[in-house]
Interface confidence: low
């Protein structure tokens, strides 16, 4: 399965926020998207394997790390109102 946490988050601007994504399928490929009205899903960052991270189309202000197969935490380095969104994590073989 693949799980994200927290389900909901309210934070002050300027705070660092980390969203967790964990998958138990041993998938190599993991992705973070944000969903906004009028834009659909936009790719933020993705990883093809351990220690591999790549920028998507809207990566500014975000970072990810991949220290193991199962996890790809997404960090909002300094939360901004423009980062208010619905975030989705995905994985694939």
């Amino acid at each position: 399965e693949i799980t994200q946490s927290p389900r909901h988050k309210i934070t002050e601007t300027g705070r660092q926020v980390t969203l967790a994504c964990h998958q138990t399928w041993n998938h190599n490929n993991m992705f973070w998207y944000r969903q906004d009205l009028g834009h659909g899903l936009r790719l933020i960052h993705y990883s093809y394997g351990v220690h591999d991270t790549n920028k998507g189309e809207v990566s500014d202000g975000y970072s990810v790390s991949r220290s193991n197969t199962e996890d790809l935490p997404l960090t909002l380095e300094s939360a901004a109102s423009s980062q208010t969104s619905v975030y989705f994590c995905a994985s694939s073989e």
Partner: antibody
Framework: EVQLVESGGDLVKPGGSLKLSCAVS????????MSWVRQTPDKRLEWVAL????????YYTDSVKGRFTISRDNAKNTLYLQMSSLKSEDTAIYYC??????????WGQGTTLTVSS | QIVLTQSPSIMSASPGEKVTMTCSVS?????MHWYQQKSGTSPKRWIY???KLASGVPARFSGSGSGTSYSLTISSMEAEDAATYYC??????????FGGGTKLEIK
Amino acid sequence: EVQLVESGGDLVKPGGSLKLSCAVSGFTFRSYGMSWVRQTPDKRLEWVALISSGGSYTYYTDSVKGRFTISRDNAKNTLYLQMSSLKSEDTAIYYCSRHGGNFFDYWGQGTTLTVSS
Amino acid sequence: QIVLTQSPSIMSASPGEKVTMTCSVSSSVSYMHWYQQKSGTSPKRWIYDTSKLASGVPARFSGSGSGTSYSLTISSMEAEDAATYYCQQWSSNPQYTFGGGTKLEIK
């Protein structure tokens, strides 16, 4: 079946250079981080270098920084280790290994580097 | 940098005997990995994430531990278990560190 086959080991004089190769088969090479790990004559294991799956990131143990370069050719399913300014303490069996997370889940049979005058 | 210290460095056990070897860590870590190496061959992943057995590893092997102390146990020694066992840990940068090994011989 996962296979990693190293080649290129040789006897080299101190200060010399050498390039090791590791031909990979049996898995999707471009999806995995890869490392070189060496085993010294006293049987100790030492991680040498890591390259991320796409080749964007490389990491080295302190003793080889600036002397060794890890690279990969995902089209050829091959991992490389370019070594220069070789020292006697680089003498070892060099293994290429696949990452299964923060560990090494498959290892090659090894190739031997001897640095001696 | 994290230092892994394995003990004993050499040990022997009789068939059927319970065997325990340890890996001490210089600072607390979350998990440990173990490899088996027989003479003239490359290391094999044996136990990962402290207690998970790699494919093909007999159920008589187990791993445990937390913090700064980890162990590998064989519930009943068999001749084919004679080998050198290495513990391994990862730390950020990244750096991968191995213990010096425990050589297990059969009596």
